[in-house]
């Protein structure tokens, strides 16, 4: 599967609208630093199947699109760019769907990229604890804001070696 | 490969002005805060202060505010250090460092060279 | 601002030693303690961050400890490229702040 080109632009566009969302200076934010534990083996490109690090980041981007749907992160943002926001993950949805659908056939998705998917819903699941936590203080919001944000990076810089590879 | 390369030495008089560079490459700049950090002859570390590149937005030591201007241009992927009127006490080696903001990440892990300012008459 | 006090401020040791240098912060820093080590005309370089993470490519004879105010950077068995002075260095809130450093010297 060729990623098309328009879905590497919308995950840039989203890391932007990413970082225009700040509200208050991360200066403040230093003591409120956490390790998530991002699963940097799952997006592993050379490693594990292009299929399994397709579905692992559609998988994330379903779940950052759930973090950013809650009622919680619609007062801790911005509402215009939370709008925007949700248009490019959906975009990026579609295009993560055809993509491995594609590459693999709908029935064996399930089964062979089950322990990605557990491994990324793992890790959203230690983001949103760590906001029940910190009583979705504006500064855990920004800590988890910069963390999304470097996964998305992360998983931007796979996406040109998965097409390098095609 | 990640790297802070820093402008060359320099030799001024007390009163002058000074903006000393520091251009990051082999990452992404505004991914990173950039740091500066004073070290006098025969001395310790001084942290100065940071800025982050992705809006400018900076904070200063306390020593130093008012001292000094950091700046940043994103789009050439470099920090700076200013003075508008050096002192003799400025004599000193001048580092950055990039930190990586609010991510679980090392903090300070790649330094420029150093860039050694004399302030004599 | 938090004071950082580093303790000895130098040393005298021999290869093969175990060396231990402390850092105590004015107040509690939780565990964001980093350690650098520096040489003569260099720039310092990373060795443990997070108080006890061990920096990439960095020899695992270095080892960190502590959280809250009390910090520990240990040599387990001191190497000829080890003698430099190393600075601990706070970075829970701005300003950040270095120790005053330790020199390990020759004995």
């Known amino acids: 599967c060729d990623l098309p080109q328009t879905h590497s632009l919308g995950n840039r566009r989203a890391l932007i609208l990413l970082a225009q969302m700040g509200r208050i200076s991360h200066f403040s934010c230093l003591k409120d630093r956490y390790d998530f534990g991002f699963p940097q083996e799952v997006f592993d490109g050379n490693q594990f199947q292009k299929a399994q690090a397709i579905s692992a980041f559609h998988e994330m981007i379903q779940q950052t699109f759930n973090l950013f749907s809650t009622k919680d992160s619609s007062a801790a943002w911005d509402e215009t760019l939370l709008d925007k926001f949700y248009i490019e993950l959906f975009q990026q949805l579609n295009d993560l769907e055809a993509c491995v659908t594609q590459e693999v056939g709908v029935e064996e998705i399930a089964l062979m990229n089950e322990d990605s998917i557990l491994a990324v819903r793992k890790y959203f699941q230690r983001i949103t604890l760590y906001l029940m936590g910190k009583k979705y203080s504006p500064c855990a919001w920004e800590v988890v804001r910069a963390e999304i944000m470097r996964s998305f990076s992360f998983s931007t810089n796979l996406q040109k070696g998965l097409r390098r590879k095609d | 490969e990640v790297q802070l390369v820093q402008s060359g030495a320099e030799v001024k008089k007390p009163g002058e002005s000074l903006k000393i560079s520091c251009k990051g490459s082999?990452?992404?700049?505004?991914?990173?805060?950039i740091g500066w950090v004073r070290q006098m002859p025969g001395k310790g570390l001084e942290w100065m202060g940071i800025?982050?590149?992705?809006?400018?937005?900076?904070r200063y030591s306390p020593s130093f505010q008012g001292q000094v201007t950091i700046s940043a241009d994103k789009s050439i992927s470099t920090a700076y250090l200013q003075w508008s009127s050096l002192k003799a006490s400025d004599t000193a080696m001048y580092y950055c460092?990039?930190?990586?903001?609010?991510?679980?990440?090392?903090?300070?892990?790649?330094w420029g060279q150093g860039t050694l300012v004399t302030v004599s008459s | 601002d938090i004071q950082m006090t580093q303790s000895p401020s130098s040393l005298s040791a021999s290869v093969g030693d175990r060396v231990t240098i402390t850092c105590r912060a004015s107040q509690s820093i939780s565990k964001f303690l980093n350690w650098y080590q520096q040489k003569p005309g260099k720039a310092p370089k990373l060795l443990i961050y997070f108080a006890s993470s061990l920096q990439s490519g960095v020899p695992s004879r270095f080892s960190g400890s502590g959280s809250g105010t009390d910090f520990t950077l240990t040599i387990s068995s001191l190497q000829p490229e080890d003698f430099a002075t190393y600075y601990c260095?706070?970075?829970?809130?701005?300003?950040?702040?270095f120790g005053q450093g330790t020199k390990v010297e020759i004995k």
């Open positions: 082999g990452y992404s700049f505004t991914s990173y805060w």
């Open positions: 460092a990039r930190h990586p903001g609010l991510n679980w990440a090392p903090d300070f892990d790649y």
């Open positions: 800025i982050d590149p992705s809006d400018s937005d900076t």
């Open positions: 260095q706070q970075s829970n809130t701005l300003p950040f702040t």
